[in-house]
């Protein structure tokens, strides 16, 4: 920043609440879509351009005037893998986090006209092109359909779909939110011959019911009913099928071949948790027991002579955890070699760090190809010579991310491709590879302004800068911006990382109010090297508040010793560690220990509430947005992963003594703002309603705000502005700021 170290002499404006709410300073992205190994699409002034990766030259793929007469606002587009058709999405209606319905039309790029015959129906739930060519699979009214050609009639694959009961090719609420992080439960084979799909049965799953108030003119509120399994409740069941799309005909029903779960899963409740095609005729399925410390991978081959799928027991791979649960949130996906006879997978090693292991399908044991007191975040690409991965190894910073390549013929030959490119500005990378990994886009998201660059895998040469946010940089030169500090403290001989957003002209000899921004859920990370323009930027820049975050026990990417510390004990160590962090920050000399606040959303709202209800005396006030209050109220898949079952034989005692309500009395010592959306399908309004009731019952005065018809994100334009304005007032009042 230009200007002076002296705050009084700095005449530049600060980053205001309005700047945040109106998004005055916009980070520019460079969102590309690879369409081959050397070409990508990029949208510029609503024209779709096709770029040559090697030379950087571009041509217009589709002019912005093409759909002037279309008559609908296009929400998204998707080009068929053979480049012959474009799928246009409109009439978008959001459902849950990932799910939505929409209308679709198909435009023939050769004929330069919309296809008017055999159109996809309105209110379609999911559509996807086959990986090659231009077949389409879609889900409508919970049933699956396939189009061999965009202008041909659809072949109906399933006939059992029923709203809120049977879901074919799409996920129910809990699978969408907690297992697949997607609405889709369809998986094309690499050449588009086979279509695999899951079927979920929610017949016995209890319904969550809540009012939706809608327009003022609605005399009686609508009741929304969603099959939602809470901890210990009846779960959905799952079946898995594969259909050969070459067999489809209008005059006979499609034959779907079922692949059943392994015997070790069928003995009790279980989940399907990963589907990965290994080759054209080999598929891997991962299954997980309801008690999520035991998973099995099946590898199944197509038998052409019988038309069935065979999963040999000798090829099963078991993954289990003795200290917690399998995977970070679920078992990681396998990355198969071209022949499908081996794969690479991120699993926990003996020391409890997540690293890449090399498996051969017919052998039980695997060979770790990475090791160290750091973790592999993700496998990004696999070629015949190299495996590319992102890790947080560099400089021992768990909150950093860099791209590495490892030579498959010699695992000792590891190269960091991003570490030294721009080490001051860029310490947190993600990557997007071309179809065969000949080129890659590096996306640096901090600590400096985001930077997007293109590279060649042949020599790892940087080809060009795609976006450097120089315009934003110039604008921010005229703003008093906060600085970000990323460091660690040592507790019980263990490093715990924190970040602080420090006010402009930060002076360690002065005393600042501190707001602890908390999430603290299992495998979370709030201390990182990412550049953000958010509410904290305003609080630090304009209100001179330090906004800190701390990754304590339970946090991720630092080994299972830290992450699994809270196994079966949510609401304990991760809560205590936030309190201890605040104490440590108080000792640093620049924190006004009479003005320490805490806030969080979702799991962060739970931890905030548990901290405020702890009676620690450290915090003056806090804000909980959409908090969990009792784990029996939250969904089965997430909750039971960490807590087991709420039964006397399992972990009922800790379910009962980890509630916010049981701490109600201690809220007399703090100022509390409780906020929730009434239409929260995820963390139900029930959770805050029960906190409110408990506080009222013991005579606690507190502040509360509900957001009518808002879901877990409270993201509508008006509600978003209202909540942050409201929270700002609360924090300023708490800190006695003008």
């Amino acid at each position: 920043n230009k200007g002076t170290d002296d705050a009084t002499a700095d005449s530049r404006k600060t980053y205001t609440l309005t700047d945040y709410l109106k998004n005055t300073y916009r980070l520019k992205l460079y969102s590309l879509r690879w369409i081959s190994d050397h070409e990508y699409l990029y949208k510029q002034e609503n024209n779709i351009l096709v770029f040559n990766a090697e030379y950087g030259n571009s041509s217009v793929f589709l002019e912005n005037s093409t759909f002037d007469e279309f008559g609908h606002s296009i929400n998204d587009y998707s080009i068929s893998p053979d480049g012959q058709f474009i799928l246009l999405e409109y009439n978008y209606v959001k459902q849950w986090r990932h799910s939505y319905t929409a209308s679709y039309d198909i435009y023939d790029l050769n004929k330069r006209q919309l296809i008017t015959e055999e159109r996809i129906p309105n209110n379609t739930q999911w559509v996807t092109w086959s990986p090659v060519g231009h077949k389409l699979a879609y889900v409508w009214n919970n049933d699956i359909y396939v189009k061999i050609e965009p202008n041909l009639p659809s072949y109906r694959i399933t006939w059992t779909g029923k709203e809120d009961i049977i879901y074919n090719g799409i996920t129910d609420w809990v699978y969408e939110e907690e297992v697949f992080s997607a609405y889709s439960a369809l998986w094309w084979s690499p050449n588009g011959t086979f279509l695999a799909y899951a079927q979920f049965n929610d017949t016995e799953v209890p319904l969550i019911e809540y009012s939706f108030y809608s327009d003022e003119s609605l005399q009686y509120p609508k009741t929304v009913r969603v099959p939602y399994p809470k901890a210990g409740a009846v779960n959905p069941t799952v079946k898995f099928f594969v259909v050969n799309t070459d067999s489809l005909s209008s005059v006979t029903n499609a034959t779907s071949i079922q692949i059943t779960a392994p015997a070790s899963m069928l003995i009790g409740d279980h989940y399907l948790c990963d589907v990965t095609w290994a080759t054209q005729e080999r598929i891997s399925l991962q299954w997980l027991r309801r008690i999520q410390n035991y998973s099995v991978m099946d590898i199944c081959d197509y038998d052409e002579s019988s038309g069935r799928w065979n999963c040999l027991v000798a090829r099963q791979h078991i993954e289990m955890s003795t200290t917690g649960w399998v995977g970070r949130f679920r078992p990681s996906e396998p990355h198969f070699t071209l022949d499908g006879n081996s794969f690479y997978k991120i699993i926990s090693n003996e020391e409890g760090y997540r690293h890449i292991c090399y498996f051969q399908i017919d052998k039980k044991d695997c060979t770790f190809i990475t090791k160290g007191t750091w973790e592999v975040i993700g496998i990004e690409a696999l070629t015949s010579d190299y495996l590319y991965y992102i890790s947080n190894e560099y400089k021992g910073m768990p909150g950093g991310r860099n791209l590495y390549k490892i030579q498959l013929s010699d695992y000792t030959k590891v190269t960091c491709l991003s570490c030294e490119l721009n080490p001051e500005r860029c310490q947190y990378y993600s990557v997007s590879f071309s179809k065969e990994a000949k080129y890659y886009q590096l996306r640096c998201s901090g600590p400096g302004l985001p930077l997007y660059t293109l590279h060649s895998s042949v020599n790892d040469k940087g080809l060009r800068v795609l976006e450097d946010n120089s315009a934003l940089d110039k604008m921010l030169q005229n703003v008093q911006m906060p600085s970000k500090k990323l460091d660690f403290i040592i507790l019980n001989e263990t490093k715990f990382w924190y970040q602080m957003i420090l006010p402009p002209h930060f002076d360690k000899s002065k005393k600042y109010p501190l707001l602890l921004d908390v999430y603290a859920g299992p495998c979370s990370q709030k201390a990182d090297t990412v550049f953000r323009l958010n509410w904290a930027t305003y609080l630090a820049s304009t209100e001179n508040i330090i906004v800190a975050s701390f990754d304590g026990r339970g946090s991720g990417y630092q080994g299972d010793k830290i992450m699994h510390a809270i196994n079966r004990r949510l609401g304990t160590f991760e809560v205590e560690d936030q309190i201890e962090a605040a104490r440590q920050f108080s000792k640093m000399g620049f924190v006004d220990n009479k003005r320490i606040a805490i806030w969080g959303w979702s799991y962060g709202g739970y931890v905030t509430s548990m901290v405020l209800g702890s009676g620690s005396g450290v915090f003056k006030c806090g804000i909980a947005v959409a908090p969990v209050s009792r784990w029996e109220y939250y969904d089965s898949v997430y909750t039971e992963r960490y807590m087991g079952l709420p039964t006397p034989e399992d972990n009922l005692d800790h379910y009962r003594n980890s509630t916010v309500m049981s701490r109600a009395e201690n809220f007399k010592q703090v100022e509390y703002l409780l906020i929730h959306g009434t239409a929260d399908d995820n963390v139900h309004f029930q959770q805050s309603a029960q906190i409110s009731k408990a506080l009222v019952d013991v005579g606690v005065d507190f502040q509360a705000m509900w957001y009518t018809d808002e879901d877990h994100g409270i993201a509508s334009s008006t509600a978003h502005q209202h909540i942050y304005t409201h929270m700002s007032h609360f924090i300023k009042q708490c800190f006695s700021l003008p």
């Epitope: 015959e117 055999e118 061999i148 050609e149 202008n151 041909l152 009639p153 072949y155 050969n244 070459d246 067999s247 489809l248 005909s249 209008s250 005059v251 006979t252 034959t255 052409e304 002579s305 019988s306 038309g307």
Partner: antibody, heavy 116, light 107 residues
Framework: EVQLVESGAGVKQPGGTLRLTCTAS????????VHWVRQAPGKGLEWVGV???????DYDAAFMSRVTISKDTSKSTVYLQMNSLRAEDTAVYYC??????????WGQGTTVTVSS | DILMTQSPSSLSASPGDRVTISCRAS??????LNWYQQKPGQAPRLLIY???NLQTGVPARFSGSGSGTDFTLTISRLEPEDFAAYYC?????????FGSGTKVEIK
């Protein structure tokens, strides 16, 4: 390369049985259905029946009682058996591959004559 | 059963002529109609599937149109090798049925 070859041609006795073989190559009988169609001398095409990839069969009602279509996937062969032959069963019999809703490959045909 | 009626049953034409053959279904078959060509002593060959889609390798002078109950096969410029019998076939419902055929002869 996809090919279908019919065999079993010849002169059959009225009241007798014919068994035609269709040998397929270049595709899997567990994926694609195989149909039989016949064509009487100087006449049009008449659908007889089909065996689908999963082994299910469908027949024209006119042949239901006396026709059986079967297959041996290990030998890549499809069979058409017709009982109680009569003179009007004299025809060229074709087998064809089912590609979705059309017949994309046909055999060359095999001639069956029913005569005493 | 769905009855397929083809007309004319035969026609005479010269090379270079434009020829249209009609096929009518006894009920709505949407676009589920295919056209086949059969030369003497040979098996039929697929020309058009699903009313208007040209099978790979078939010359562009062949085209199909129609939906519901009325369909047309058009040969824009007749070539000597096009003299043959032509059959329509519905594929929407079992039993599958063919038209009785149209024989295109040299004038």
């Amino acid at each position: 390369e996809v090919q279908l070859v019919e065999s079993g041609a010849g002169v059959k006795q009225p009241g007798g049985t014919l068994r035609l073989t269709c040998t397929a190559s270049g595709f899997s009988l567990t994926t694609y259905g195989v149909h039989w169609v016949r064509q009487a001398p100087g006449k049009g095409l008449e659908w007889v029946g089909v065996i689908w990839g999963d082994g299910r069969t469908d027949y024209d009602a006119a042949f239901m009682s006396r026709v059986t279509i079967s297959k041996d996937t290990s030998k890549s062969t499809v069979y058409l058996q017709m009982n109680s032959l009569r003179a009007e069963d004299t025809a060229v019999y074709y087998c064809m591959r089912n590609r979705h809703d059309w017949f994309d490959y046909w055999g060359q045909g095999t001639t069956v004559t029913v005569s005493s | 059963d769905i009855l397929m009626t083809q007309s004319p049953s035969s026609l005479s034409a010269s090379p270079g002529d434009r020829v249209t053959i009609s096929c009518r279904a006894s009920q709505d078959i949407r676009n589920n109609l295919n056209w086949y060509q059969q030369k003497p002593g040979q098996a039929p060959r697929l020309l058009i599937y699903y009313s208007s889609n040209l099978q790979t390798g078939v010359p562009a002078r062949f085209s199909g149109s129609g939906s519901g109950t009325d369909f047309t096969l058009t040969i824009s410029r007749l070539e000597p090798e096009d003299f043959a019998a032509y059959y329509c076939q519905q594929s929407i419902k079992l039993p599958l049925t063919f038209g009785s055929g149209t024989k295109v002869e040299i004038k």
